[in-house]
Structure formats: structure tokens, C-alpha cells
């Protein structure tokens, strides 16, 4: 089989602003906000996939909802859609029992917790259309969470929820190159709660990372390290109990 694929090909992207496996409803977020040109797909979740995705079928290995992935998760269809109401997520900050996960424990995870800090290998590097899903529970009285996409000694993307920075809750994103941190990007929307379960999804796009928490879009971070394919691990640290960390291509 001929394989003329290059990194340039990978970075050309699919052009689908709302791929299957990525949260499709954004609560009160206006259409097109958060770097989604042209609005989201009406009625995309549940029951309808956006054009060009996987109608009526979970993409292979999608998480959760793929057959066998989590007991009680609906399949086919990747995410069953948020509860009705003014927001995209229940006010408690936890998924309802009728959502993607069963009510029996945090996200119905299949196996014991992972040791934090945790390094998730990315043995082929980071590529566009890679969807990374991290499930866990914030510890009581948590101070911080950190995700670090590492390229050698550099940190291509540092995602750092801080629970008490000068009595404020804030998410700080940054990049570290040659041992120097760059300009911080700060986000005051803070979807994490001490003691509560969470789901973080990071979708790699050709020119940015998209981050969603608990099925709601949170932020995007433009690539400062362009050689995505040289990022070889994702460090997960902080005040969390980590249930799982995995990825799929969508």
C-alpha cells in the first residue's frame, strides 16, 4: 500500500467544525462562538450526526458510548446529548443518570484508578482529529489540576485549572519553550468542583486544541508548538483521582 502521507497532510484538517464524538450542544453559548465558524449543527445530538461524520454509528473506539466502553453508556451514538433546560449540563455539575453514564459511581468507569501524576504515552505523536478523554474526580479541597502536552522538555500546551489563585478560580493555559513560559491565556469560566467527577476532552485541530469539560465547550488554545507530531506524552497531575485517560481518532 502506497503511503505518501506527510505531516502537511495531517494538518490540512477535515473541515468539519463539529465532528462526531465532540460535544455537539453548547448550552447558552451562541452559535459560532468559541472558534466554531458557521454555528453548530441543529439537533446533532442525540440522534443525528453532523454531515460527514458517522451517522447512526459510533466512530471506532469512541469514548464513551462505543459498545463495550462503559457499562450503561448508550450505543450507538457517541454522546447522548445534554439534558434539556437552560444550560448544557445539570446544575449540580454532574451528569444525570439518564445521560452518558450510569448513576453507579463516577462515570461508570470500568477499572481501578490510575496513579497521579500520570504520563499518557502518545507514541505516534499528536495528530489532528485525535480526541483525548480524561475521566476522574476532583479531590476535596483541591488546589490545582494540570495537563501538560510534552515535546521533549518543552510543554506545547499546559492546561491548568487553579482552584484558589488569590481567592479566585481560574484556568491558565500556556506553553513552555526552552525552559521559558510564554504569555498566559486565562479563562474565568470554571467548570470543575471539588469532590465532583469530571470529564475533560481535548480535541486536536490543525491550528488549535479544543477543550471541553463535562460535555460543554470550554476553550481553545492556538498551537504555539507547530510540530504537533513531536509531542510524545501527556502529563496529568494535580489534586484528582484519575479514572482513565485514553484517546481515539475521530
Amino acid at each position: 500500500m502506497a503511503d505518501n502521507f506527510s505531516l502537511h497532510d495531517a494538518l490540512s484538517g477535515s473541515g468539519n467544525p463539529n465532528p462526531q464524538g465532540w460535544p455537539g450542544a453548547w448550552g447558552n453559548q451562541p452559535a459560532g462562538a468559541g472558534g466554531y465558524p458557521g454555528a453548530s449543527y441543529p439537533g446533532a445530538y442525540p440522534g443525528q450526526a453532523p454531515p460527514g461524520a458517522y451517522p447512526g454509528q459510533a466512530p471506532p473506539g469512541a469514548y464513551p458510548g462505543a459498545p463495550g466502553a462503559y457499562p450503561g453508556a448508550p450505543a450507538p451514538g457517541v454522546y447522548p446529548g445534554p439534558p434539556s433546560g437552560p444550560g448544557a449540563y445539570p446544575s449540580s455539575g454532574q451528569p444525570s443518570a439518564t445521560g452518558a453514564y450510569p448513576a453507579t459511581g463516577p462515570y461508570g468507569a470500568p477499572a481501578g484508578p490510575l496513579i497521579v501524576p500520570y504520563n499518557l504515552p502518545l507514541p505516534g505523536g499528536v495528530v489532528p482529529r485525535m480526541l483525548i478523554t480524561i475521566l476522574g474526580t476532583v479531590k476535596p479541597n483541591a488546589n490545582r489540576i494540570a495537563l501538560d502536552f510534552q515535546r521533549g522538555n518543552d510543554v506545547a500546551f499546559h492546561f491548568n485549572p487553579r482552584f484558589n489563585e488569590n481567592n479566585r478560580r481560574v484556568i491558565v493555559c500556556n506553553t513552555k519553550l526552552d525552559n521559558n513560559w510564554g504569555r498566559e491565556e486565562r479563562q474565568s469560566v470554571f467548570p470543575f468542583e471539588s469532590g465532583k467527577p469530571f470529564k475533560i476532552q481535548v480535541l486536536v485541530e490543525p491550528d488549535h486544541f479544543k477543550v471541553a469539560v463535562n460535555d460543554a465547550h470550554l476553550l481553545q488554545y492556538n498551537h504555539r508548538v507547530k510540530k504537533l507530531n513531536e509531542i510524545s506524552k501527556l502529563g496529568i497531575s494535580g489534586d484528582i483521582d484519575l479514572t482513565s485517560a485514553s484517546y481515539t481518532m475521530i
Epitope: 503511503d3 502521507f5 505516534g124 505523536g125 507530531n229 513531536e230 479514572t243 485517560a245 481518532m249
Partner: antibody
Amino acid sequence: QVQLQQPGAELVKPGASVKLSCKASGYTFTSYWMHWVKQRPGQGLEWIGMIHPNSGSTDYNEKFKNKATLNVDKSSSTAYIQLSSLTSEDSAVYYCTRWGIYYYARDYWGQGTTLTVSS
Amino acid sequence: DIVMTQSQKFMSTSVGERVSITCKASQNVGTNVAWYQQKAGQSLELLIYGASNRHTGVPDRFTGSGSGTDFTLTITNVQSEDMTNYFCEQYSNFPLTFGAGTKLELK
């Protein structure tokens, strides 16, 4: 057509070092991580480490950090593994494997080099 | 290190039958598991990645399933050329680790 070409066999003496090669063709060498895997009869498969040909960035299995050194020659699209202070425990088949991008796993393997360490 | 246990070193089957090869991880590896086939005297070939995704060109009689700690490679309508070695690998944690292999034999 993707190919990873490895010499069939190497015979070296205990205490010596050896450098095994893996010549890649049929794809953009600098766009994919190259991994090395050791297979001993009855011992299964062991991951040694990985290298990105563009940057030379490496990750090693701790077990092999003092045994193996990975490098590449971009001009010839060749990956190398150097094994030092050889003993009979290092006698094995060594595979270079490409980690895929579309197919996120070891999508291509070399034929392997059989290394025999013997006096 | 994560240990990938393929509890059956050998499995006997017949042409046309269905067989399931199992692999158990010592801790949660999500869906970060691949399956490879190794024919005698040859290198390995990718069958399944991401626990359940069939590699291009792999016959659809090969199916992967599982997540967390328990994984299965199922071969339906086994063919004579399938009588060979199968290895699982986890890539959820460094170091990446393989199962010891399962050899499919003719009953």
C-alpha cells in the same frame, strides 16, 4: 510502498557494541515516530524506545536506558539502535517499527535483525 | 510496569470455528490496546488498534473488543492461515508493554 529494511543477522562478541540499522522508504521519514522492539524466544516482546526523526527527540524504556541509544540519519532515511556492553542476554531479534498516524499503532514493522552475542 | 496477561499460550481450534483470544491488563489502559499477528519466521503485522479498530486490509473475521482491563481478539470463521501467534500491546503507560503471546493451533 512503505518498507523498513533491516539486515538479517549480526554476530558480535561479548563486551562489544553494535549498531543496527533500519532504512525507511515509501513515506515521509521525518513525520513518524520510529520505535524499536526486542524479541527473545520464550521472553516475548519488549519495547526499547522511540525516536522522532525530525527532532531526534527520544523516549526510552528505563530498562534499556543504559543499554540502547537511538539515533537517525535524515539524509538517508535510516534509523539506528546502538547496543553496548553486549552479553548473551542481548541475543535477540530487534525490530524497527513505525508508529502510524492514521492507524495509531505499529502499522509497519521491519523484518528484524537477529543479533547473536557469542565468543 | 503494566503487565499484559495472555493467559492461554496455546489455543486449539478448527477451520471454520470461532475463537476468542484474551488479554488482561494489570491496570486500566482505556482503549489503548493493539493486536498483532506474527507468522512463523516473520515479523509482526497490525490487526487491531484502539482496542476495536481494524487495520486497513485486515479481513473482517478479525474483531477486537474491550476496554479498561479486559480485551478480546475474536476470529470468526477461522482459516488455516490464522493458525499462528497473536500478541496484544498496551500503549496507555510507559513503558509500552506486550502480552506473552497466544499461539493458535489446529485441533
